[in-house]
C-alpha cells in the first residue's frame, strides 16, 4: 500500500484546512490508527490528533476543539482531518503516520500554507497645489502573507515607487504615487489596486485628487461701451475666474465707496439705472485658500447728449 496526501495545502486565514492522508491499501489491509503531528524543522513533533480504528478521534490538548474528522460517509482507510479556523501560527509542516495491518507503518508530510489577505489602506499625501514640483499624491499600504502586490490605476501621469518590509509571518508593501500637480488633474480618480492569492478579486481604494489653483481674473460686461449710458437699466459687471477650492469674490471701487444702489451678488456687480455717479474704477478681488487675484475696470457712463464717446479702459492685475 501507499499513502496519498498533498505536498501543500493552501487555506485562507479563518477557513478550515483539510489535511489529507489516505491509505491506498491492498485488499484485506486494515488501518489501526492515523497519528497527526506538527513537525516543523528545529522543533520537536507536536501531536495534533489520533484517529483510532477502535477508540475514534483523539485531539491533543493544544488543538482541543479545532480538529475534526471530515463529515460522513468516511472510508476506514481515510485518515484526513479538518483543522478548523486556520490561523497564521498553523502554517508549517505536518506529518501523518499510518499504522496498518499487516503492512506496517507509513508516513507522509505536507506543508500547510495559511494565506493572510491584506487589508489595504490609502493615505493621501500633502495638499496638492498647482506650481509645485514632483509631489506625493498618495501612498497605499497592504500587509499580508505572502506579500501582496500593490499597483495604481489612473489616467493621471505620475511615477510610482514601492518598498517592502518583511515581518516574521507576513510582509507589508507600501507604494507611493508622485505627480506634478496641475489643474487638469483636479477631480481625477487615483486608485490603489491590491492583488493577493487570498483575495477572490483585487481590492481597490480610490482617492479623488484635489489640486489647489486660482485662474487669472477678468471682468465681463464692458464689451460694448456704448451701452453704458445714463438711464440704462440692468447694467452689470461679472468677474470671471475659477479655482480649487472654489474662490470667493469681492467688489470694491478704487476711487471711493461703492455707489448707493449698487448690489454685490458674489461674482456679479449689479447697477441701478446708470448715472454719472457710477463712473469710476471697479476692482474685482478673487481669492481662495491657495491664492488671490485682482482685476480692475474703468466704467465711464456716457451722457447721450454729448457727441463724443469716452474711452473705457480694462486693466487686469494680480
Amino acid at each position: 500500500g501507499e499513502l496519498e496526501t498533498s505536498d501543500v495545502v493552501t487555506v485562507v486565514l479563518g477557513q478550515d484546512a483539510k489535511l489529507p492522508c489516505f491509505y491506498r491499501g491492498d485488499s484485506g489491509e486494515q488501518v489501526g490508527q492515523v497519528a497527526w503531528a506538527r513537525v516543523d524543522a528545529g522543533e520537536g513533533a507536536q501531536e495534533l490528533a489520533l484517529l483510532h480504528s477502535k477508540y475514534g478521534l483523539h485531539v491533543s490538548p493544544a488543538y482541543e476543539g479545532r480538529v475534526e474528522q471530515p463529515p460522513p460517509p468516511r472510508n476506514p482507510l481515510d485518515g484526513s482531518v479538518l483543522l478548523r479556523n486556520a490561523v497564521q501560527a498553523d502554517e508549517g509542516e505536518y506529518e501523518c503516520r499510518v499504522s496498518t495491518f499487516p503492512a506496517g507503518s507509513f508516513q507522509a508530510r505536507l506543508r500547510l500554507r495559511v494565506l493572510v489577505p491584506p487589508l489595504p489602506s490609502l493615505n493621501p499625501g500633502p495638499a496638492l497645489e498647482e506650481g509645485q514640483g514632483l509631489t506625493l499624491a498618495a501612498s497605499c499600504t497592504a500587509e499580508g502573507s505572502p506579500a501582496p502586490s500593490v499597483t495604481w490605476d489612473t489616467e493621471v501621469k505620475g511615477t510610482t515607487s514601492s518598498r517592502s518590509f518583511k515581518h516574521s509571518r507576513s510582509a507589508a508593501v507600501t507604494s507611493e504615487f508622485h505627480l506634478v500637480p496641475s489643474r487638469s488633474m483636479n477631480g481625477q480618480p487615483l486608485t490603489c489596486v491590491v492583488s493577493h492569492p487570498g483575495l477572490l478579486q483585487d481590492q481597490r481604494i480610490t482617492h479623488i485628487l484635489h489640486v489647489s489653483f486660482l485662474a487669472e481674473a477678468s471682468v465681463r460686461g464692458l464689451e460694448d461701451q456704448n451701452l453704458w449710458h445714463i438711464g440704462r437699466e440692468g447694467a452689470m459687471l461679472k468677474c470671471l475666474s475659477e479655482g480649487q477650492p472654489p474662490p470667493s469674490y469681492n467688489w470694491t471701487r478704487l476711487d471711493g465707496p461703492l455707489p448707493s444702489g449698487v448690489r454685490v451678488d458674489g461674482d456679479t456687480l449689479g447697477f441701478p439705472p446708470l448715472t454719472t455717479e457710477h463712473s469710476g474704477i471697479y476692482v474685482c478681488h478673487v481669492s481662495n485658500e491657495f491664492s488671490s487675484r485682482d482685476s480692475q475696470v474703468t466704467v465711464d457712463v456716457l451722457d447721450p447728449q454729448e457727441d463724443s464717446g469716452k474711452q473705457v479702459d480694462l486693466v487686469s492685475a494680480s
Partner: antibody
C-alpha cells in the same frame, strides 16, 4: 502468562519516603506503557502516574506531582514509584498495571489497563 | 480533569437479571472508555475497552455501548460470579479518571 508483582509497601511516617517496585514477566516489558493506580481503603480507584515505553515521557496526577517519581528499567523488566513527602491521604493499596498496546507512538493518549498486579499496601501514619 | 459519573452507585439484582450501568463523561471522549470489574481484596480486571470491545477471555454476556459522553455497561444475564464493583475509566486525557464505582449486590 503476564504477571506483575508489586513490592516495597509498608508503614511509613508522614513526611517519609518509600520506593515501590513492580516486577514484570511473561511479555516484552519494554514495548508497553505502564501506570500506577491506587485505592484508598473502602474507596474507588485513582490513577497516580504513567510512563511511556522508553521512559522519556511521564505523567502524574496533580495530587502527587512534585512528590512522586515514576521510572522504569527495561533491562530489569521493572517499574518503580519513588514516593517522597508522604501524607496520610496517600494511604492506599498501590497497583501497577500494564497499558493495552493498541495505540502506537502517541504520547497524548493513555490506553486501558489490561493487566494488574495484586497490589501493595502503603500506610502513612504516625 | 474529566469527571466520570456512574449511576447507580449500587444496585441489587438476582441471578439471571439484565443489569445496566451508565457512565457519563463531563466532556466528549470519543470511545476512549474502559470498564473494569473488581472483587473484594482483588485487583481490577479489564472487561471492555474502546467503549464496546470485549477484552479477550471475558464472557459475552458483558457488553458496552456509547460514544462521546454517554456510555453503558450491560450484563445480559447476571451470574453469581458477577457480583462485584464495576468502574468506568476514560483515557482520552491525562490524567485518566475513573467513575466512583457501581456495586452490584445479590438481592
Amino acid at each position: 502468562e503476564v504477571q506483575l508483582v508489586e513490592s516495597g509497601g509498608g508503614l511509613v511516617q508522614p513526611g517519609g519516603s518509600l520506593r515501590l517496585s513492580c516486577a514484570a514477566s511473561g511479555y516484552n516489558f519494554g514495548s508497553y506503557d505502564m501506570s500506577w493506580v491506587r485505592q484508598a481503603p473502602g474507596k474507588g480507584l485513582e490513577w497516580v502516574s504513567g510512563i511511556k515505553t522508553y521512559g522519556g515521557n511521564t505523567h502524574y496526577a496533580d495530587s502527587v506531582k512534585g512528590r512522586f517519581t515514576i521510572s522504569r528499567d527495561n533491562s530489569k523488566n521493572t517499574l518503580y514509584l519513588q514516593m517522597n513527602s508522604l501524607r496520610a491521604e496517600d494511604t492506599a493499596v498501590y497497583y501497577c498495571a500494564r497499558e493495552y498496546s493498541d495505540v502506537v507512538d502517541y504520547v497524548s493518549v493513555r490506553t486501558p489497563l489490561d493487566y494488574w498486579g495484586q497490589g501493595t499496601l502503603v500506610t502513612v501514619s504516625s | 480533569d474529566i469527571q466520570m459519573t456512574q449511576s447507580p452507585s449500587s444496585l441489587s439484582a438476582s441471578v439471571g437479571d439484565r443489569v445496566t450501568i451508565t457512565c457519563r463523561a463531563s466532556q466528549g471522549i470519543s470511545s476512549y472508555l474502559a470498564w473494569y470489574q473488581q472483587k473484594p481484596g482483588k485487583a481490577p480486571k479489564l472487561l471492555i475497552y474502546a467503549a464496546s470491545s470485549l477484552q479477550s477471555g471475558v464472557p459475552s454476556r458483558f457488553s458496552g455501548s456509547g460514544s462521546g459522553t454517554d456510555f453503558t455497561l450491560t450484563i445480559s444475564s447476571l451470574q453469581p460470579e458477577d457480583f462485584a464493583t464495576y468502574y468506568c475509566q476514560q483515557h482520552y486525557t491525562t490524567p485518566p479518571t475513573f467513575g466512583q464505582g457501581t456495586k452490584v449486590e445479590i438481592k
